[in-house]
């Protein structure tokens, strides 16, 4: 399977909400012995590869923000913890999954990574990520609403 990032850049005004999105592509085994774990974290653009660092988003780690289910089942983080930080991650039946960040500030600007881990009984994890950039702007040059820029190449790299 692969992870696609429909948009590589989100430019948003301060105070706005934004939903960052990734999509699980390709053959997805829906067997009883496979589980998909999806999560989000912040990173920085490394010289060699993106998403190599795993930093918290608004002090919440990837473990705090994870989604967990089989195949393309829907799931969402109903965690009070996430919502107290203005965050919510969710996924649908079609392989789309997202994180919504409310009331953006300039400190939210940076590189965001989605991570999908396929977990199989007695097999090593298969890990794939996608990356996108969020720019939060303020002042007269800031857009009135979020502007999104499509990815030139939507497929993520496979990191295992």
């Amino acid at each position: 399977f692969k992870v696609a990032t429909p948009y590589s850049l989100y430019v948003c005004p301060e105070g706005q909400n934004v939903t960052l999105t990734c999509r699980l592509l390709g053959p997805v085994d829906k067997g009883h012995d496979v589980t998909f774990y999806k999560t989000w974290y912040r990173s920085s653009r490394g010289e060699v590869q993106t998403c190599s660092e795993a930093r918290p988003i608004r002090n919440l780690t990837a473990a705090d923000l994870h989604l967990h289910h089989g195949g393309h089942q829907a799931a969402n983080t109903s965690h009070d913890l996430a919502q107290r930080h203005g965050l919510e991650s969710a996924s649908d039946h079609h392989g789309n999954f997202s994180i919504t960040m409310r009331n953006l500030t300039l400190l939210d600007s940076g590189l965001y990574c989605c991570l999908v881990v396929e977990i199989r009984h007695h097999h090593s994890e298969h890990r794939v990520h996608g990356a996108m950039e969020l720019q939060v702007q303020t002042g007269k040059d800031a857009p009135s609403n979020c502007v999104v820029y499509p990815s030139s190449s939507q497929d993520s790299e496979n990191i295992t």
């Epitope: 774990y37 795993a54 990837a62």
Partner: antibody, heavy 119, light 107 residues
Framework: QLQLQESGPGLVKPSETLSLTCTVS??????????WGWIRQPPGKGLEWIGS???????YYNPSLKSRVTISVDTSKNQCSLKLNSVTTADTAVYYC???????????WGQGTLVTVSS | DIQMTQSPSSLSASVGDRVTITCRAS??????LAWYQQKPEKAPKSLIY???SLQSGVPSRFSGSGSGTDFTLTISSLQPEDFATYYC?????????FGQGTKLEIK
């Protein structure tokens, strides 16, 4: 605050089965997105991963021990268990249980329990 | 299995020194590497994950770097409580493996 506590006999005879239990408090062992692992450390030596159990029951074992090890979970007691059969003196070690989120390292550890294999 | 090799195996240093410990993986592990600190008769404590991310509550004098096969743990200014044994661990693939440890002693 998550706490992990290992318990079990401190002395096991050669060829017998080592049985340890890890009791989790301050969190649920069935919480999705986590593995519960066992690591051991022979006296004066380094760390060796024994195996891990995923919250949904999937297990992963170190090939060097796979034929002798079983890790299981009892969600009603919030416990994870380790069984290692046919032990020898080389299995004398401090045994730790630890938690690690998916695609992450061991972030919470028990204090460890020393198991000596001796006749 | 992926072999993790730490160097040096032991190191003597003084309070205030800058110390670097290296860890090499026998094959590429991306950034799936952690560093732990262990004091005598205690369980290991996680310091660094994802090669360079600081575990919550760990002092900022600890830092990690590297990707692929070569990694380093740096303590910018040694404090008395930092004298301990340090281990690297790869969690790129099973079986998870640890380095043999680096014992940091007072000079």
């Amino acid at each position: 605050q998550l706490q992990l506590q290992e318990s079990g006999p401190g002395l096991v005879k050669p060829s017998e089965t080592l049985s340890l239990t890890c009791t989790v408090s301050g969190g649920s062992i069935s919480s999705s997105g986590y593995y519960w692992g066992w690591i051991r450390q022979p006296p004066g030596k380094g760390l060796e991963w024994i195996g891990s159990l995923y919250s949904s029951g999937y297990t992963y074992y170190n090939p060097s021990l796979k034929s002798r090890v079983t890790i299981s979970v009892d969600t009603s007691k919030n416990q994870c268990s380790l069984k290692l059969n046919s032990v020898t003196t080389a299995d004398t070690a401090v045994y730790y249980c630890a938690r690690h989120p998916v695609a992450m390292n061991f972030d919470d550890w028990g204090q460890g329990t020393l198991v000596t294999v001796s006749s | 299995d992926i072999q993790m090799t730490q160097s040096p195996s032991s190191l003597s240093a003084s309070v205030g020194d800058r110390v670097t410990i290296t860890c090499r993986a026998s094959q590429g592990i991306s950034s799936w590497l952690a560093w732990y600190q262990q004091k005598p008769e205690k369980a290991p404590k996680s310091l660094i994950y994802a090669a360079s991310s600081l575990q919550s509550g760990v002092p900022s004098r600890f830092s990690g770097s590297g990707s692929g096969t070569d990694f380093t743990l740096t303590i910018s200014s040694l404090q008395p409580e930092d004298f301990a044994t340090y281990y690297c661990q790869q969690y790129n693939s099973y079986p998870y493996t640890f380095g043999q440890g680096t014992k940091l002693e007072i000079k």
